[in-house]
């Protein structure tokens, strides 16, 4: 979690500033939504459990030429133990069921300010 | 519009069980915690517990733990609650209430915002 | 178990009055995000409780400008600048910060 804060942070950020912050990154993407995020691209869902970070960046890697989960993407990559590449998959994904960009952020957000909430941070 | 029916009003023997629903319409119960609050005669208000019914994670008060279970089935938007092993003390008034969270907020945790009316249940042999 | 004591029990008043109702937690209601979940709800007799202020200071949608609240810690405060004929009920504070949660004994505002 320690590069969450950016090339400026004085050190190491806080799991719950870290949370927040993806949760204040999500929320933007929610309601700066004019066109289909990401044009409509449909991504695996994922079961939002332990070890659903890497699930979810798993997920949004496979999405490319979308600027609005970049940072996501970025973000989420701090919450991730290993690398995680692209045709890379988890046993956490539902791979039977692919949902929209803005569907999986949807209930991504809903999730982790559920997780914010109970002070689940790691 | 915003709205939890609970089931009516239960008469029970001490030592049975009661399970108390509470059917919610307006909003997706997924995206909320549900609540369970009683009230006995002329007195304040108690919490019991709650559950996230996107994942059936409960949380209880200890004193109430293995005799009060909470459950919710999305399909239905309904949430239960169940107090076994039942006694005169138990006779209360027994409300469901929601805390939501919306899309648009950082930090949108609104509390109980939304009750249901409320079921008595009155346990008497 | 965090307790929650509010002071007074009861608490006559007349319309125009302003009113405080004190609740003090048995140690520090602040969540490990930071946040505080105090709570303050109003009831009627026979009547479900209603949220009218949440995280110490924010008021609920639809809640009148004149109830307030305010404090930090373990002290907190549900003012009412100017009671109207409607805001007599019975008032708790209430802790969403660790579990269990727990409400107030509750104060009684009556009509003087």
């Known amino acids: 979690l320690t590069c969450l804060g950016g090339f400026a942070s004085p050190g190491p950020v806080p799991p719950s500033t870290a949370l927040r912050e993806l949760i204040e990154e999500l929320v933007n993407i929610t309601q700066n939504q004019k066109a289909p995020l990401c044009n409509g691209s449909m991504v695996w869902s994922i079961n939002l459990t332990a070890g659903m970070y890497c699930a979810a960046l798993e997920s949004l890697i496979n999405v490319s030429g979308c600027s609005a989960i970049e940072k996501t993407q970025r973000m989420l990559s701090g919450f991730c133990p290993h690398k995680v590449s692209a045709g890379q998959f988890s046993s956490l994904h539902v791979r039977d069921t692919k949902i929209e960009v803005a569907q999986f952020v949807k209930d991504l957000l809903l999730h982790l300010k559920k997780l914010f909430r109970e002070g689940q941070f790691n | 519009q915003v709205q939890l029916v609970q089931s009516g009003a239960e008469v029970k023997k001490p030592g049975s069980s009661v399970k108390v629903s509470c059917k919610a319409s307006?909003?997706?119960?997924?995206?909320?915690?549900m609540h369970w609050v009683r009230q006995a005669p002329g007195q304040g208000l108690e919490w019991m517990g709650t559950?996230?019914?996107?994942?059936?994670?409960?949380k209880y008060v200890p004193k109430f733990q293995g005799r009060v279970t909470i459950t919710a089935d999305e399909s239905t938007s309904t949430a239960y609650m169940e107090l076994s092993s039942l006694r005169s003390e138990d006779t209360a008034v027994y409300y469901c209430?929601?805390?939501?969270?919306?899309?648009?907020?950082?930090?949108?945790?609104?509390?109980?915002?939304?009750w249901g009316q409320g079921t008595l249940v009155t346990v008497s042999s | 178990d965090i307790q929650m004591t509010q002071s007074p029990s009861s608490l006559s008043a007349s319309v125009g009055d302003r009113v405080t109702i004190t609740c003090r937690s048995s140690?520090?209601?602040?969540?490990?995000?930071?946040?505080?979940?105090l709570e303050w709800y109003q009831q009627k007799p026979g009547k479900a409780p209603k949220l009218l202020i949440y995280?110490?200071?924010d008021r609920f949608s639809g809640v009148p400008s004149r109830f307030s609240g305010s404090g930090s810690g373990t002290d907190f405060t549900l003012t009412i600048s100017s009671l109207q004929p409607e805001d007599f009920a019975t008032y708790y504070c209430?802790?969403?910060?660790?579990?269990?949660?727990?409400f107030g004994q509750g104060t009684k505002l009556e009509i003087k």
């Open positions: 209430f802790q969403g910060s660790h579990v269990p949660w727990t």
């Open positions: 209430a929601r805390s939501i969270y919306d899309d648009y907020h950082v930090d949108d945790y609104y509390a109980m915002d939304y």
């Open positions: 995280k110490i200071s």
């Open positions: 307006g909003f997706y119960i997924k995206d909320t915690y």
């Open positions: 559950i996230d019914p996107a994942n059936g994670n409960t």
């Open positions: 140690q520090n209601i602040v969540h490990i995000n930071g946040n505080t979940y």
